[in-house]
Every structure is written in structure tokens, then in C-alpha cells.
């Protein structure tokens, strides 16, 4: 024959524990029903009668089966340097992460207790180690060849461009600046050249610019990428 | 007219060195900078070094960084490869590249490559 | 792997229009860095065909053609010869390299 389905409360057989979601009762000496996440166990249960729930209060919550007879308080607001990434509902406690920019200095169970924010690299530091959600950023100096001419969290040290004719040489928090060649229409591969930023990144640098060979006017070309100069008639 | 000739290729053993020579005429020598360019058997073009047009200053790719030194000779118009500690991964076809007018990231002319081949 | 990509292969016959794309990212072609295409003919060295994204060298028939839009570039190849089967190479300066950085190549057939 089938064995009876016990329903709460019950004595347990001798030896065996009570079911899943199930509680034994030391006072009532009895399997009862636990109280479901966003709940608590207003009545506890008694030999002839099962736990009575209730729903969580405002600002209160439990997250697991339970019998508590209260329910946990939610954490304190977020403060300006964290975001909300959870918010307290009957079955969940506020998660607070740090907002960007920001570190967890010193972490609690879910979320963070305290932020920190990310160390910035100085000009002529890049960063060797970006910040993560738990650890700060670490910096470097820019080895020679490369440089960093920001304030920044984020930017690592970028190689200085390649220069036909090196105007300024880079140093560790700028980059090189290059001359112009403006050599004679045969030796061109094309019909105009015009002034150009160029750019990648220097091995190794001497403090001292190049003697320009080049005929003609010379211009300093600026860093980084952009069009080419308006109404320019070539180098 | 431009014209780049490399030179100095060879069967080197792993660990060994080679200078690797580029002659070049028809252009201001001095005004441009100057690339290595290398190509292994059937695969695609890797940039490997390059000076500037005064030699002040040296690029290089990280594979050959410390091993590798570019120099160059505007009295000859002659640039050089100085290549130490090769490695199998170094055979390759090297070319030597003119840096492109305004802009040295392109290469307008290239020489007609030689072999190195790093092999026991 | 190469820090451009490009298709390994492509084809088409003579007379048709062929297109071969290269794609890069942030540090490289989408920070606003010119795009360079070389033709390689088998045997022989490299040999600029565009420059700065759309510009010829003299003596580059006007049947090759460049742009660039984003992150991509591409070549395009009308009136297809057969003196146009070749290895294609894109290149462009990266942010974070020392040097320039070129695509895989991509071998084309006319069939």
C-alpha cells in the first residue's frame, strides 16, 4: 500500500527529518511549514496547528524559506558614489555597486560597503593594470617610446608616431611631432600630397630634433587622426 | 626615379646574426623615414622596424624588439638591419620601405626583397 | 591573427566589378587613421595602389578605387583583368603599435 502523505504539522518518523521546506519545531516537536521568500512566521506552528505567515513589511524582506518571526531590515540607501543595482523588494535586500569610475574598497556580503575612486595616471604614467570592480588602477611610467599626455583611469601609454622628419621628439607625456617633407612632384607616387597627422609609436628617442633635408616649406603636422588640410596644395 | 636594393639575406642558424643592407637612390634620403617590412613564406606582410629621417629616432614591433636594430647611413643613403638572436619564426622575405610623403604609415616604394631563412 | 581582416579569397571574371573589404576596430581604422591598399603580384614585392583611403599613386589605373566608412575600408576593383589576380593587402596605423598593421591579404582569382 502507498504510504499516507503526512500533512504539517506531523511528528516525523523516528530518525528522519522533515521534508523540503519543511521545519521541525523543537517546542511543538513537530515537521511545519516554513513561510515562503518574502514572508516571515507571524504564529508559530503547534501540535495541532501550522505556522501562520505574514507578508514582509516596507524596507523589510527575506530571501529564503524561513520561520523568522521578523524580517530582515533592507541595507541604508545607496550613497552618491554607488548606483542601485538591486532594489529592496519583500524578497530581496538593495545591492549597492560602485558607479563608475569608482571601486569597491571594502565589500560586504552582496554589494559594496565603502567606494573608492579609481586612481587617475598622471602625464607621463600609463595604466599597467586597469581598475576592476574590486581593485584599484595601477600605474607605470611611460617606458621610452611611448607616452601618456592625460589625466585618466583608462589610458594606457601609446607609442609615439612615426615621424618622416622628427620636429620635437616625444617624450614619456608627449608625442613626437613631426615635420613635413615637401619634396619635388617626380618623387611623389601620386599627382598632390597633402600635410598629413601621422602617428604610431617611437622605440626609442634622442632629445634632440632632426636637421630637415626637405625642400620648400615645412609644417608642423598635429597629432592624431584628421582629414587632411583644407585647400592645401601639397607639401 | 626611386630605387631601393636590399642586400645580405642568407641561411643563418637559430642564434645567429645577419645585417641586412638597403641602397636607395632618386629621393632625398634624408627627408623620409625608412621601414623594414618582412614577409614569411606564403603568409601575408608584417611591418617590422622603422627610423626616422634624421635617424634620431628607432620603431620597432614588439617580435623584434631587443633582438633587431635599425640604423642608416644618410651619407650613403643606405639603410641597415642589424638582425641578432634569430629564430625560425625570422625566415622571411625582408623588404625595405620608403615612408610615404607627409604621412610615413604608407610605403610608396618598396625594394625587391631579400631572403633570410634561419634554419639547423 | 592579424589586427586587420580581410576575406582570405576572393574572385570574379574578366569584365566584372570586385569589392574586397577590410575591417578593423576603435584603435585602428575607426580612430580615424587613413587606410592604405598594396597589390602584390605573385613574385614580386608589394606596390602602393591606394593611399590615404581613396587617393592613386600615378600610374594606378583609375579602376581601382578606395573608401572607408567606420571601423571598414574597401577595394574596388572594376572592369576585372587578368593581370589583376594578386595577393591584396589593407593596412593602417594602430593607437596602440609601434608601426603600422596590415591585413591578412586576400588573393584574388579572375576566373
Known amino acids: 500500500l502507498p504510504a499516507q502523505v503526512a500533512f504539517t504539522p506531523y511528528a516525523p518518523e523516528p530518525g528522519s527529518t522533515c521534508r523540503l521546506r519543511e521545519y521541525y519545531d523543537q517546542t511543538a516537536q513537530m515537521c511545519c511549514s516554513k513561510c515562503s521568500p518574502g514572508q516571515h512566521a507571524k504564529v508559530f506552528c503547534t501540535k495541532t496547528s501550522d505556522t501562520v505567515c505574514d507578508s514582509c513589511e516596507d524596507s523589510t524582506y527575506t530571501q529564503l524559506w524561513n520561520w523568522v518571526p521578523e524580517c530582515l531590515s533592507c541595507g541604508s540607501r545607496c550613497s552618491s558614489d554607488q548606483v542601485e543595482t538591486q532594489a529592496c523588494t519583500r524578497e530581496q535586500n538593495r545591492i549597492c555597486t560602485c558607479r563608475p569610475g569608482w571601486y569597491c574598497a571594502l565589500s560586504k556580503q552582496e554589494g559594496c560597503r565603502l567606494c573608492a575612486p579609481l586612481r587617475k595616471c598622471r602625464p607621463g604614467f600609463g595604466v599597467a593594470r586597469p581598475g576592476t570592480e574590486t581593485s584599484d588602477v595601477v600605474c607605470k611610467p611611460c617606458a621610452p617610446g611611448t607616452f601618456s599626455n592625460t589625466t585618466s583611469s583608462t589610458d594606457i601609454c601609446r607609442p609615439h608616431q612615426i615621424c618622416n622628419v622628427v620636429a620635437i621628439p616625444g617624450n614619456a607625456s608627449m608625442d613626437a611631432v613631426c615635420t613635413s617633407t615637401s619634396p619635388t612632384r617626380s618623387m611623389a607616387p601620386g599627382a598632390v600630397h597633402l600635410p598629413q597627422p601621422v602617428s604610431t609609436r617611437s622605440q626609442h628617442t634622442q632629445p634632440t630634433p632632426e636637421p630637415s633635408t626637405a625642400p620648400s616649406t615645412s609644417f608642423l603636422l598635429p597629432m592624431g587622426p584628421s582629414p587632411p588640410a583644407e585647400g592645401s596644395t601639397g607639401d | 626615379e626611386v630605387q631601393l636594393l636590399e642586400s645580405g639575406g642568407g641561411l643563418v642558424q637559430p642564434g645567429g646574426s645577419l645585417r641586412l643592407s638597403c641602397a636607395a637612390s632618386?629621393?632625398?634620403?634624408?627627408?623620409?623615414?625608412m621601414h623594414w617590412v618582412r614577409q614569411a613564406p606564403g603568409k601575408g606582410l608584417e611591418w617590422v622596424s622603422a627610423?626616422?629621417?634624421?635617424?634620431?629616432?628607432?620603431y620597432y614591433a614588439d617580435s623584434v624588439k631587443g633582438r633587431f636594430t635599425i640604423s642608416r647611413d644618410n651619407s650613403k643613403n643606405t639603410l641597415y638591419l642589424q638582425m641578432n638572436s634569430l629564430r625560425a619564426e625570422d625566415t622571411a622575405v625582408y623588404y625595405c620601405?620608403?615612408?610615404?610623403?607627409?604621412?610615413?604609415?604608407?610605403?610608396?616604394?618598396w625594394g625587391q626583397g631579400t631572403l633570410v631563412t634561419v634554419s639547423s | 591573427q592579424s589586427v586587420l581582416t580581410q576575406p582570405p579569397s576572393a574572385s570574379g571574371t574578366p569584365g566584372q566589378r570586385v569589392t574586397i573589404s577590410c575591417t578593423g576596430s576603435?584603435?585602428?581604422?575607426?580612430?580615424?587613421?587613413?587606410v592604405h591598399w598594396y597589390q602584390q603580384l605573385p613574385g614580386t614585392a608589394p606596390k602602393l595602389l591606394i593611399y590615404?583611403?581613396?587617393q592613386r599613386p600615378s600610374g594606378v589605373p583609375d579602376r581601382f578605387s578606395g573608401s572607408k566608412s567606420g571601423t571598414s575600408a574597401s577595394l574596388a576593383i572594376s572592369g576585372l583583368r587578368s593581370e589583376d589576380e594578386a595577393d591584396y593587402y589593407c593596412?593602417?596605423?594602430?593607437?596602440?603599435?609601434?608601426?603600422?598593421?596590415f591585413g591578412g591579404g586576400t588573393k584574388l582569382t579572375v576566373l
Open positions: 590615404r583611403n581613396n
Open positions: 576603435s584603435s585602428n581604422i575607426g580612430a580615424g587613421y587613413d
Open positions: 627610423i626616422s629621417g634624421g635617424a634620431t629616432t628607432t
Open positions: 593596412a593602417a596605423r594602430d593607437d596602440g603599435l609601434s608601426g603600422p598593421v
Open positions: 620601405a620608403k615612408g610615404g610623403t607627409g604621412d610615413p604609415y604608407y610605403f610608396d616604394y
Open positions: 632618386g629621393f632625398t634620403f634624408s627627408s623620409y623615414a
